[in-house]
Amino acid sequence: VPDKTVRWCAVSEHEATKCQSFRDHMKSVIPSDGPSVACVKKASYLDCIRAIAANEADAVTLDAGLVYDAYLAPNNLKPVVAEFYGSKEDPQTFYYAVAVVKKDSGFQMNQLRGKKSCHTGLGRSAGWNIPIGLLYCDLPEPRKPLEKAVANFFSGSCAPCADGTDFPQLCQLCPGCGCSTLNQYFGYSGAFKCLKDGAGDVAFVKHSTIFENLANKADRDQYELLCLDNTRKPVDEYKDCHLAQVPSHTVVARSMGGKEDLIWELLNQAQEHFGKDKSKEFQLFSSPHGKDLLFKDSAHGFLKVPPRMDAKMYLGYEYVTAIRNLREGTCPEAPTDECKPVKWCALSHHERLKCDEWSVNSVGKIECVSAETTEDCIAKIMNGEADAMSLDGGFVYIAGKCGLVPVLAENYNKSDNCEDTPEAGYFAIAVVKKSASDLTWDNLKGKKSCHTAVGRTAGWNIPMGLLYNKINHCRFDEFFSEGCAPGSKKDSSLCKLCMGSGLNLCEPNNKEGYYGYTGAFRCLVEKGDVAFVKHQTVPQNTGGKNPDPWAKNLNEKDYELLCLDGTRKPVEEYANCHLARAPNHAVVTRKDKEACVHKILRQQQHLFGSNVTDCSGNFCLFRSETKDLLFRDDTVCLAKLHDRNTYEKYLGEEYVKAVGNLRKCSTSSLLEACTFRRP
């Protein structure tokens, strides 16, 4: 088999026939050096998954539940291409599983016990697996058999396809529990009708069901969605209020050596030649000898799944939680009203050491998880491996796009009511040496630049956003002669000035000596022409305040700020000479952890915050000798956000717009992955 062959896995005679036709038609339109198809027949999807894992096949298309099976060890497959539905302009690759209720019914998600439920069918995704999986740990014990536990949880149900003899309560709202459209309450529309008729109190369906069944907005307005945070939202706000976001149908491949680029090349060419309305003789999305052979008949095309996206991220935390609960049947022993330890995400072993000290002192309230980059930490919080971390505004933006929420803000000014008064923000500045007297904001081209890290506010988003508006392209590595912007591509000129050794060179963590505010300033001191930092950086590292050898003899007066009008000012005049105001760093978490993270962090700062006077003898949460480990060292307290509890509200319209403009220059693989899930 030549190297450019994709071995497609078929699960029936009809699929194998269509696969051979696919193979032959592709041969006729693709040059001999292009990708080709070979067909491998197996007895089931699970056999296909095993065959791909064993390198006996390369690809198969699966629904969400099987994508989960494919991801589990030892299979370790990953999503590589998604089918989309709808139009090319507005492609739909996911649907949302929702809980629909009548507007005047007055209960929340955590009050479903004793209510009457309408399901599309036993064992179906949106109608059963997702809601029951998410409710699993609230079901009365014993939880097996599952149908009995569900029957005892709700006061009555219609769950088509259930065994009405053994579990009559599941068929109480639709006698007989018929498993076809002969049962008026079967399927998506049936489950909604069960709610509409007043038989049930809640219907578990998908987001489009209500629109397909009620064309009139006034009628739709009589219904609401139950959200997982125990609030309600209008039915058109399903993107912010759903039980899970579920991929419709996905091509999977091996995680390592999985030919993902070749599979995409093949399918992209296939959709060009044999996609919707392309060819009479062979149609990719049509199954004359069956239904949904190889691909769904309703699909309109394919989209490449971003490479950063593993199955856990693709399926989403809620879906994975629901399916894992159903499959593994394990629930935490702690009462649900008690907070579990908060798993803090620490960057590299530097932060890990401080985090472990915090953990030991917290007596089990804090646990530590490590990752090498901020984006890896955000991904771990998304999938539940970690719970929280404090982030610069640029990463609050990415975390927000990935569904996380800000929960507390770092405050940097001492005030009587620190915890109740979130600040307006800090200033992003451009610092130069006083001796380089000809340097201004207008002649930075060809100079050597020092940045806190790619994607961070003061060090990157603000200065590069302003620069982009001037030069109208993203080739910042050509604008500056060289620099250190941790997180840049290793061969970029923006890694040339960095000081990390070996693999740590230009890494966006403390293993790179020029990382962060202090690191960027050190880069200016030792090698650079300009450093993009926060307004407190120079005073915090001069006048003997930083005892490190490189900093101990520095004088604030030897540095100046570049103003946007082309002038320069002394460092202390930052209020009249800065690039922009930056939102303070903030702690982010998943929505489901918001209350517990808030509660535990407020307790922790009362124990280890700024009220601790002797930090050499006692653990101090906000101190790490200018390294900004876990939190900025100038943090006075963590403040409540009040109503600024989404990333857009927290960062403010102006900053969100600025980062949005810079998105075309983004190298963030995580941002690409998250915007695939939510464009």
Partner: nanobody, 114 residues
Framework: QVQLVESGGGLVQAGGSLRLSCAAS????????MAWYRQAPGNQRGLVAA???????RYADSVKGRFTISRDNAKNTMYLQMNSLKPEDTAVYYC????????WGQGIQVTVSS
């Protein structure tokens, strides 16, 4: 600046024992937190054992009952007594400490053969 130097590593048979030492020099402040970490190839560095200056001790679940951390403040030295060693204990072991700053040793290899 504080320097940390590990010693006592080496090759040992499964079921055997080793005692690692970590000597701190250059410290003008008490080291408030001292810990042992380990890193096996392809894995992240993980906490093995830690002790605060107040005497609170924590062990990783995988070493509880087999490893013991202790410190001799007079000698500015920390120890890790490792008993009933298993092949999965093979790793580079790092000594780490914190006062206001954080400090790391260079690491020392421990190999447990079966």
């Amino acid at each position: 600046q504080v320097q940390l130097v590990e010693s006592g590593g080496g090759l040992v048979q499964a079921g055997g024992s080793l005692r690692l030492s970590c000597a701190a020099s250059g410290s003008i402040r008490p080291l408030r937190f001292m810990a042992w970490y380990r890193q096996a190839p392809g894995n992240q560095r993980g906490l093995v054992a830690a002790e605060t200056s107040g005497g609170t001790i924590r062990y990783a679940d995988s070493v509880k009952g087999r490893f013991t951390i202790s410190r001799d403040n007079a000698k500015n030295t920390m120890y890790l007594q490792m008993n009933s060693l298993k092949p999965e204990d093979t790793a580079v072991y790092y000594c780490a400490a914190r006062d206001l700053d954080d400090y790391w040793g260079q690491g020392i290899q421990v190999t447990v053969s079966s």
